[in-house]
């Protein structure tokens, strides 16, 4: 009975290994809401997929507890900057948990991309990448936020994205 | 008979797990061809290796279908820039598939690094990192392209590289 | 006897798979020593953890040989720059091995972030991310170095970090 149980467990593990949780969500025209909320993402079209994770209002929702490598890239760009050279961009991955009322910072970057544009009419591009391993419980959510989101450039889902996989 | 089959399958899976596909390719003097093609990479010397993936003319070639975390970093630098502050660099990972005649953009970054050289010295450095999970079929290929590749600096294989592993 | 051995091996593997080596270490006030040594890291508090890897004086120490995706991000920032606009930052992951007296470069980035600050009193932010797959033997160590570390900004463990997981 014990060995049979172990056997079942192994079979189960093999099956679950086949669907090791992973996701890659892509930027879309609807990603930037301007509402102060997190970025929204495409979950099905093109390169986007969900496997063993779910999605809700910008958040990757964990269904199986464990350690996950989570990542996000955002494409930044503009013609000049809203606050000139002093403009700072904060790009972060944040956790929402039922056990705590506020979002928790997981991985964060700050950049001053506008120093690259020495006049108000100068076109500039920059990119911010974040990635790291965090522990997530079932039901917890991860979202991406960018402040100032006016500087995020979206096009075809290849330049701004958000993903995770269990390690 | 069934259990024996399952047993064989588990044994097989254990062996394949031991060779979970992974690769890390490094930049070399021959990486930049100037031909308009993708960057070429070192596959064996130093830190470079291929495990369960193959290589052909700059491309990582998939032998086992699945979801892969693919990544690339390029070291950028120069003395001034060919187009001044307007110089833009596009660094991307692209998929080649037998089912489609053109390369497909997977992950892309655009940067304007030349604003980093604002003093008389004109010397600047920048770096671009890309990483994300994509689904790849057996026989499909992934390549790295950089436009303008004149701004890529190669030295010892640690500053510009390209890799992947199955998740 | 053979099958029982295989069974034990599978059970063992399942257990070891449950503890696939992984770690995420976070920046802390004590990270910057100014001694010329590597950065030091928080290993337990907050988001930091070690699972199947150990830590010693800034180094992730490998206990199980294999291929690892190693990564680090450092948050850079300042008011002006110590060497003016020409300041270059080198951020790297380095291997220490008992078989060789010197550290070996694994993944390295160079950046000139200060070109973003067009006057000596200008505040600027930048970020450097590195990640890639390397083979590590049991007992080998990986450390993070940043030159010039005066430009690294630490706050709460989310902006500068160091991690790894076996692939």
């Amino acid at each position: 009975d014990g060995p049979a149980g172990s056997w079942e467990q192994l079979i189960q593990e093999r099956r679950s290994h086949e669907v090791n949780p992973a996701a890659h969500l892509t930027g879309a025209n609807s990603s930037l809401t301007g509402s102060g909320g997190p970025l929204l993402w495409e979950t099905q079209l093109g390169l986007a997929f969900l496997r063993g994770l779910s999605y809700h209002d910008g958040a990757l929702v964990v269904t199986k507890a464990g350690y996950y490598y989570i990542y996000s890239k955002v494409q930044l760009g503009g013609v000049g900057c809203p606050l000139g050279l002093a403009s700072t961009i904060t790009h972060g991955l944040y956790k929402r948990t039922p056990r705590y009322p506020e979002e928790l910072e997981l991985l964060v970057s700050q950049q001053s991309p506008c120093g690259r544009a020495t006049s108000s009419s100068r076109v500039w591009w920059d990119s911010s990448f974040l990635g790291g391993v965090v522990h997530l419980e079932a039901g917890e959510e991860v979202v991406v936020r960018v402040l100032d989101e006016r500087l995020v450039r979206l096009r075809d889902g290849t330049r701004s994205y958000f993903g995770a996989f269990m390690v | 008979d069934g259990p024996a089959g399952s047993w064989e399958q588990l044994i097989q899976e254990r062996r394949s797990h031991e060779v979970n596909p992974a690769a890390h390719l490094t930049g070399a003097n021959s990486s930049l061809t100037g031909s308009g093609g993708p960057l070429l990479w070192e596959t064996q010397l130093g830190l470079a290796f291929l495990r369960g993936l193959s290589y052909h003319d700059g491309a990582l070639v998939v032998t086992k279908a699945g979801y892969y975390y693919i990544y690339s970093k390029v070291q950028l630098g120069g003395v001034g820039c060919p187009l001044g502050l307007a110089s833009t660099i596009t660094h991307g990972l692209y998929k080649r598939t037998p089912r489609y005649p053109e390369e497909l953009e997977l992950l892309v970054s655009q940067q304007s690094p030349c604003g980093r050289a604002t003093s008389s010295s004109r010397v600047w450095w920048d770096s671009s990192f890309l990483g994300g999970v994509v689904h790849l079929e057996a026989g499909e290929e992934v390549v790295v392209r950089v436009l303008d590749e004149r701004l890529v600096r190669l030295r010892d294989g640690t500053r510009s590289y390209f890799g992947a592993f199955m998740v | 006897d053979g099958p029982a051995g295989s069974w034990e091996q599978l059970i063992q593997e399942r257990r070891s798979h449950e503890v696939n080596p992984a770690a995420h270490l976070t920046g802390a006030n004590s990270s910057l020593t100014g001694s010329g040594g590597p950065l030091l890291w928080e290993t337990q508090l907050g988001l930091a953890f070690l699972r199947g890897l150990s830590y010693h004086d800034g180094a992730l120490v490998v206990t199980k040989a294999g291929y690892y995706y190693i990564y680090s991000k450092v948050q850079l920032g300042g008011v002006g720059c110590p060497l003016g606009l020409a300041s270059t930052i080198t951020h790297g992951l380095y291997k220490r091995t008992p078989r060789y007296p010197e550290e070996l470069e694994l993944l390295v980035s160079q950046q000139s972030p200060c070109g973003r600050a067009t006057s000596s009193s200008r505040v600027w932010w930048d970020s450097s991310f590195l990640g890639g797959v390397v083979h590590l033997e049991a007992g080998e160590e990986v450390v993070v170095r940043v030159l010039d570390e005066r430009l690294v900004r630490l706050r709460d463990g989310t902006r500068s970090y160091f991690g790894a997981f076996m692939v």
């Epitope: - | 001034g80 820039c81 307007a86 008389s120 600096r153 | -």
Partner: antibody
């Protein structure tokens, strides 16, 4: 083939301004930097600065800052160098020189324009 | 600014012989393994002509008898077998820092 054709010789009085043109052909004009270099009698070559035709961005040798102005007319693939407050020591042959593919050398040059400053 | 010093000021060499011209920079002109040093030839009434870029790269269309070497602060232009058309003034030029600066020139004359 690549050609840079400059405007003709000029004679100017001290305090006046001169504007020299350099018309490019035979290549994609906006892809290459244009530099200005002068050679005074009995002197060596002196770099005055550069212009990026793609954007109009300019970098000047500090020595000429405030007196030299580089402009571009992309419609005619022409760059201009204007030098004001002329003095006798500005008497020289002025050259435009195209930035090479690797942009930190000058691979094609105009034939030169002699500017004489004399009262 | 970076000062470029060429020597000798005048070099007299017979046709068919080898000529070696030197150029010293007041500070290193190297970046990431490349030297930002160029050599030009100028004849009377003509614009300069690029011979060597990045210290040792021969410009397209320039005869192989011209070669460049050096790194850091010391550079050499060598003409292996002088032809009659090689007698001219030669300038070195650094491009690592603004303002770009030239040496004062070496006049290569027929001996």
């Amino acid at each position: 083939q690549v050609q840079l054709v400059q405007s003709g010789a000029e004679v100017k009085k001290p305090g006046a301004s001169v504007k020299v043109s350099c018309k490019a052909s035979g290549y994609t004009f906006i892809d290459h930097i244009m530099n200005w270099v002068r050679k005074a009698p009995g002197q060596g070559l002196e770099w005055m600065g550069r212009i990026y035709p793609v954007s109009g961005e300019t970098n000047y040798n500090q020595k000429f800052m405030g007196r030299a102005t580089f402009t571009v007319d992309r419609s005619t693939s022409t760059v201009y160098m204007e030098l004001s407050s002329l003095r006798s020591e500005d008497t020289a042959v002025y050259y435009c020189g195209r930035g090479s593919y690797y942009w930190n050398a000058m691979d094609y040059w105009g034939q030169g324009t002699l500017v004489t400053v004399s009262s | 600014e970076i000062v470029m010093t060429q020597s000798p000021a005048t070099l007299s060499v017979s046709p068919g012989e080898r000529a070696t011209l030197s150029c010293k920079a007041s500070q290193s002109v190297d970046f990431d393994g490349d030297s930002y040093m160029n050599w030009y030839q100028q004849k009377p009434g003509q614009p300069p002509r690029l011979l060597i870029y990045s210290a040792s790269n021969l410009e397209s269309g320039i005869p192989a008898r011209f070669s460049g070497s050096g790194s850091g602060t010391e550079f050499t232009l060598t003409i292996s077998s002088l032809q009659s058309e090689d007698f001219a003034v030669y300038y070195c030029q650094q491009s690592i820092e603004d303002p770009w600066t030239f040496g004062q020139g070496t006049k290569l004359e027929i001996k």
